[in-house]
């Protein structure tokens, strides 16, 4: 029986060009975590496997860093990175747990834009 729950950072926002940490945490179970997948709806970003270590998809190699822990750091964010991210925890003996994070990548703040175009 699956007793665990996944806690995520939920809905998060970050600025274009910045970085963000995607983090999930599995609690309320003694199941052993053997693999964690980080995914978008149509492609895999990264896998952390207990035996094989980290695998980062070639599409993301330049701007995805493993960790901290079982999390994933996205760097050099673009507006196209806005969307859903899923952590999939493969555990023994429970099975699979899934968490969802929605990331919104924002243009630089209005204040910054204002400062740039201020007339002296």
């Amino acid at each position: 029986m699956m007793t665990g729950t996944i806690e995520t950072t939920g809905n998060i926002s970050a600025e274009k060009g910045g970085s963000i940490i995607l983090q999930c945490h599995l609690s309320s179970t003694t199941a052993q975590v053997t693999q964690v997948n980080w995914e978008q709806q149509d492609q895999l970003l990264a896998i952390c496997n207990a035996d094989l270590g980290w695998h980062i998809s070639p599409s993301f190699k330049d701007r995805v860093a493993p960790g901290p822990g079982l999390g994933l750091t996205l760097q050099s964010l673009t507006v196209n990175d806005t969307g859903e991210y899923f952590c999939i925890y493969h555990t023994y003996p429970d099975g699979t747990y899934t968490g969802r994070i929605f990331l919104e990548v924002l243009e630089s703040s209005v204040a910054e834009h204002g400062a740039r175009f201020q007339i002296p």
Epitope: Q35, Q41, L44, S57
Partner: antibody, heavy 117, light 107 residues
Framework: EVQLKQSGAEVKKPGATVKISCKVS????????IHWVQQAPGKGLEWMGY????????KYNETFKGRVTITADTSTDTAYMELSSLRSEDTAVYFC??????????WGQGTLVTVSS | DIQMTQSPSSLSASVGDRVTITCKAS??????VAWYQQKPGKAPKLLIY???YRYTGVPSRFSGSGSGTDFTLTISSLQPEDFATYYC?????????FGAGTKLELK
């Protein structure tokens, strides 16, 4: 209990359009994508595309060259697959499947589409 | 697109035999491979996902292994109900692709 129930068999003429439905029950429809898979007689499985009912986003296999359209009605928990400009090689069984992202634990029973003049 | 090359295309075996089916991906897919069993007139059934994780209710005689480009489905002791067609599928990225299938027949 998760179930995907597809509409019945269809016979169509070349050039026509077919629209197959897949009604789901037993889970929250908007939580997972619905994928469509084609299986021609005696052949293997070919992925056609998916819809994610939460936001209506879709992704298609280029093989079907714009002939396939996948939609979803969240008021009835039903996904649809429409295939246009039918030709004889589209004669196949079409399955809807629920993804755990991109692997499929739940499948519809299949819908046979026969294209014949 | 990622091609999945499955072998053999057909296989004759007896009840109690150990059987191995292989699948080779055209690029590194890490552990993102699933295996399905299909019987005539029925929908496929998920056996294994993420290369080695047995889906709920799947008998322990089915096991999957591999990572990168080379993957294996093993049935440790064939039972009468195991005679069917088996497909591998990469779930790394879209377009999702399947192997051509392995038809397992009674010798």
């Amino acid at each position: 209990e998760v179930q995907l129930k597809q509409s019945g068999a269809e016979v169509k003429k070349p050039g026509a359009t077919v629209k197959i439905s897949c009604k789901v029950s037993g889970y929250t429809f908007t939580d997972q994508a619905i994928h469509w898979v084609q299986q021609a007689p005696g052949k293997g499985l070919e992925w056609m595309g998916y819809i994610y009912p939460r936001d209506g986003s879709t992704k298609y296999n280029e093989t079907f060259k714009g002939r396939v359209t996948i939609t979803a009605d969240t008021s009835t928990d039903t996904a649809y697959m429409e295939l246009s400009s039918l030709r004889s090689e589209d004669t196949a069984v079409y399955f809807c499947a629920r993804g755990m992202l991109r692997w499929f634990a739940y499948w519809g029973q299949g819908t046979l589409v026969t294209v014949s003049s | 697109d990622i091609q999945m090359t499955q072998s053999p295309s057909s296989l004759s075996a007896s009840v109690g035999d150990r059987v191995t089916i292989t699948c080779k991906a055209s690029q590194d897919v890490s552990t993102a491979v699933a295996w399905y069993q299909q019987k005539p007139g029925k929908a496929p059934k998920l056996l294994i996902y993420s290369a080695s994780y047995r889906y709920t209710g799947v008998p322990s005689r089915f096991s999957g292994s591999g990572s990168g480009t080379d993957f294996t489905l093993t049935i440790s002791s064939l039972q009468p109900e195991d005679f069917a067609t088996y497909y591998c599928q990469q779930h790394y990225s879209t377009p999702l692709t399947f192997g051509a299938g392995t038809k397992l027949e009674l010798k």
